[in-house]
C-alpha cells in the first residue's frame, strides 16, 4: 500500500485570501483505506473525504494557520503526515516618510509595511538600500508594531515601522534610497521595495570624493517590486560609505536598465540607449539646471542630449528614464572630465 500527500511539503505558506488544496490519499490491498484529517478547525466544507482519500481545502484565512495531520489506515497498518500551514499577509503597501530626502540635513526616514501577518520580527526584516546595497552608516531606531484598524472582525493584521537616522549622503547626494522589506517564510521569501527620492540641488554639486575624475553613475528604480524566490537567499553585502563607491553602475543584476555614453567628438553629447528588446523607449528626465535649455533628440531606444550653444557639458547629475518599467540610470559628470561610458 502507498500513502501520499500532495503537495508533499511538511510546511506550506499560503497567502491570505488564496486557497490551497492538500490531498491525502492511500491505496489499500485489503479493501478501502480510511483517510481523514485531524487537528484543524475544519469547519463544514473544508474537508472532502472520498474513498481512500481526503482533500483539505485551506481558504487563506488567518484562522487556517495550524498543523493538520492526515491519518491513513489500512487494516492494521496506519500512516500519518503533518503539514504546518502558515497563512501570511504581505501586500505591496509600503509607505515611506518623508516623501523625499534633503541632502545635508540630519534626518530620520521611516518605512511602514501595512497589513502584515505574521507580525514577527524574525519573519520580517527592513533594509535601507543605496542602489542594491545596504546604506552604510544608517542607524536603525527602534521598530514599531501596531495593530491595523480592521473593517471586519477576525485575526488582526499589523503595520510594522522601521526608522533610520541617515548618515551624510555624500556630495553629490544619490538620486534615491530604497526601503526594502523582506518576509521570510518556509521555502518562500517575499520582497517589496519603495523608492525615497533625494531632492537634487539646482546648483551644481561638488564632484564625489573619488580618486579619478570619471563620471559617477548610480542606477535607481522608480518602481516598487515584489519577488518570490526559493530558499536560496543571498544576503545583501555591506557597502562602503557613499563617497567611496566606484564610478560605475551599482546594479549588476535585476531589471535591464538604460546605458549612458559620452561622445566628445559630437561636442559633449550624451547618448542614452536601451537594449532591452523591442518596444522600449528612453528619454532624458534630469540635467543640471533646466532640462529645457538642452538640445534633445529622442528616437525610440536612443536619446541624445547636448549643450546649447555647443561647449563643455555642465557639471552635475544627468538622468535617463526607460519605459515601460520606469528604470532610470543616473550619471554624474564632474567638470572637465575625460569622456566615459556607463557600461
Amino acid at each position: 500500500q502507498s500513502f501520499q500527500v500532495n503537495p508533499p511539503e511538511s510546511e506550506v505558506a499560503v497567502a491570505m485570501g488564496t486557497s490551497l488544496q492538500i490531498t491525502c490519499s492511500m491505496s489499500c490491498d485489503e479493501g478501502v483505506a480510511r483517510v481523514h484529517w485531524r487537528g484543524l478547525d475544519t469547519s463544514l466544507g473544508s474537508v472532502q473525504t472520498l474513498p481512500g482519500s481526503s482533500i483539505l481545502s485551506v481558504r487563506g484565512m488567518l484562522s487556517d494557520t495550524g498543523t493538520p495531520v492526515c491519518v491513513g489506515s489500512c487494516g492494521s497498518r496506519s500512516f500519518q503526515h503533518s503539514v504546518k500551514i502558515l497563512v501570511y499577509a504581505f501586500p505591496d503597501q509600503l509607505v515611506v516618510s518623508p516623501e523625499f530626502l534633503v541632502p545635508g540635513q540630519d534626518q530620520v526616514v521611516s518605512c511602514t509595511a501595512h497589513n502584515i501577518w505574521p507580525a514577527d520580527p524574525n519573519s520580517l526584516s527592513f533594509a535601507l538600500l543605496l542602489g542594491e546595497q545596504r546604506l552604510e552608516g544608517a542607524q536603525a531606531l527602534e521598530p514599531e508594531q501596531e495593530e491595523e484598524i480592521q473593517e471586519a472582525e477576525g485575526t488582526p493584521l499589523f503595520r510594522m515601522t522601521q526608522r533610520w537616522r541617515l548618515p551624510s549622503l555624500g556630495t553629490p547626494a544619490p538620486p534615491a534610497l530604497h526601503c526594502q522589506v523582506t518576509m521570510q517564510l518556509p521555502k518562500l521569501v517575499l520582497t517589496h521595495r519603495k523608492e525615497i527620492p533625494v531632492l537634487q540641488s539646482q546648483t551644481s554639486p561638488k564632484p564625489p570624493n573619488t580618486t579619478s575624475a570619471e563620471p559617477y553613475i548610480l542606477t535607481s528604480s522608480s518602481t516598487a517590486e515584489a519577488v518570490s524566490t526559493g530558499l536560496n537567499i543571498t544576503t545583501l553585502p555591506s557597502a562602503p560609505p557613499y563617497p567611496k563607491l566606484s564610478p560605475r553602475t551599482l546594479s549588476s543584476e535585476g531589471p535591464c536598465r538604460p546605458k549612458i555614453h559620452q561622445d566628445l567628438e559630437a561636442g559633449w553629447e550624451l547618448l542614452c540607449e536601451a537594449s532591452c528588446g523591442p518596444g522600449v523607449t528612453v528619454r532624458w528626465t534630469l540635467a543640471p539646471g533646466d532640462l529645457a535649455t538642452y538640445h534633445k533628440r529622442e528616437a525610440g531606444a536612443q536619446a541624445w542630449l547636448s549643450v546649447l550653444p555647443p561647449g563643455p557639458m555642465v557639471e552635475g547629475w544627468f538622468q535617463c528614464r526607460q519605459d515601460p518599467g520606469g528604470e532610470v540610470t543616473n550619471l554624474y559628470v564632474p567638470g572637465q572630465v575625460t569622456p566615459n561610458s556607463s557600461s
Epitope: 540630519d106 530620520v108 542607524q139 531606531l141 527602534e142 537616522r165 548618515p167 551624510s168
Partner: antibody, heavy 119, light 107 residues
C-alpha cells in the same frame, strides 16, 4: 569649549521622583540628539534614553520605559530626565551625552550626577 | 538587542607593553562601533569611533580595527595614564549597547 553639566541628583526613597538637568554650552544645542547613560556602582555603562534635536523622537531602555521621561528646552540649552517610581536598582551615576550628527557615537559626556534610591 | 562581549574582563600590564582588547557583537554592527576610556570617578572619554577612526586629541598609540562582529582596541605602548577601564559600544541600532568593560591594571 563644548561642555555638559548634570545636576539634580540626590538621595530619594523608593517610589519617589527626581528630575535631572543637563546644561549644555559651547555648541548649537538644538542641532544635536542627546542621551542619558547611567552607571550603577561598580558596574558598566547602560544607555537609558535619547531625544532628537527637535524633540520629535524619543526612546527608552526597557528597564526605564514608562517611568522615565526625557525632554529638552532648546531655548535654555538644557536636557532633562524626569524619573518617577524610582527603584533601588536605579541607583547610579547619570551622565548626559551628546550624539554626533551623521555618525551617532557619543562624542561629549558630562561629568555625571549621582542618584541614590534607598529607604 | 545586540549583545557586546569584551575580553578579557581585566588584564595586568606594564608601562611600554602592547595591549589588545577585543569586543564581539552578537550580530553585525558593520563599522558602527566606538571605544571609550573611563577612569575612576570620571566620565567616559571617546577614543575611537567608526571602528578605527581616532577621535581628535587622542594619542596615536590608540588604534581600533575590525568590522562586522569582531573588533579590537590596541594600545601600542602602554603609558601610566592609560590604566583605566575600556568599553566598546555599538551604535548600529537601538538600544545602543556597551560591552561589560575591560579593566587595565598595573602589573
Amino acid at each position: 569649549e563644548v561642555q555638559l553639566l548634570e545636576s539634580g541628583g540626590g538621595l530619594v526613597q523608593p517610589g519617589g521622583s527626581l528630575r535631572l538637568s543637563c546644561a549644555a554650552s559651547g555648541f548649537t544645542f538644538s542641532d544635536f540628539w542627546m542621551h542619558w547613560v547611567r552607571q550603577a556602582p561598580g558596574k558598566g555603562l547602560e544607555w537609558i534614553s535619547y531625544i532628537s534635536g527637535s524633540s520629535g523622537y524619543t526612546n527608552y531602555a526597557d528597564s526605564v520605559k514608562g517611568r522615565f521621561t526625557i525632554s529638552r528646552d532648546n531655548s535654555k540649552n538644557t536636557l532633562y530626565l524626569q524619573m518617577n517610581s524610582l527603584r533601588a536598582e536605579d541607583t547610579a551615576v547619570y551622565y548626559c551625552a551628546r550624539d554626533r550628527p551623521y555618525y551617532y557615537y557619543m562624542d561629549v559626556w558630562g561629568k555625571g550626577t549621582t542618584v541614590t534610591v534607598s529607604s | 538587542d545586540i549583545q557586546m562581549t569584551q575580553s578579557p574582563s581585566s588584564l595586568s600590564a606594564s608601562v611600554g607593553d602592547r595591549v589588545t582588547i577585543t569586543c564581539r557583537a552578537s550580530q553585525s554592527v558593520s563599522r558602527s562601533l566606538a571605544w571609550y576610556q573611563q577612569k575612576p570617578g570620571k566620565a567616559p572619554k571617546l577614543l575611537i569611533y567608526a571602528a578605527s577612526s581616532l577621535q581628535s586629541g587622542v594619542p596615536s598609540r590608540f588604534s581600533g580595527s575590525g568590522s562586522g562582529t569582531d573588533f579590537t582596541l590596541t594600545i601600542s605602548s602602554l603609558q601610566p595614564e592609560d590604566f583605566a577601564t575600556y568599553y566598546c559600544q555599538q551604535y548600529k541600532s537601538y538600544p545602543v549597547t556597551f560591552g561589560q568593560g575591560t579593566k587595565v591594571e598595573i602589573k
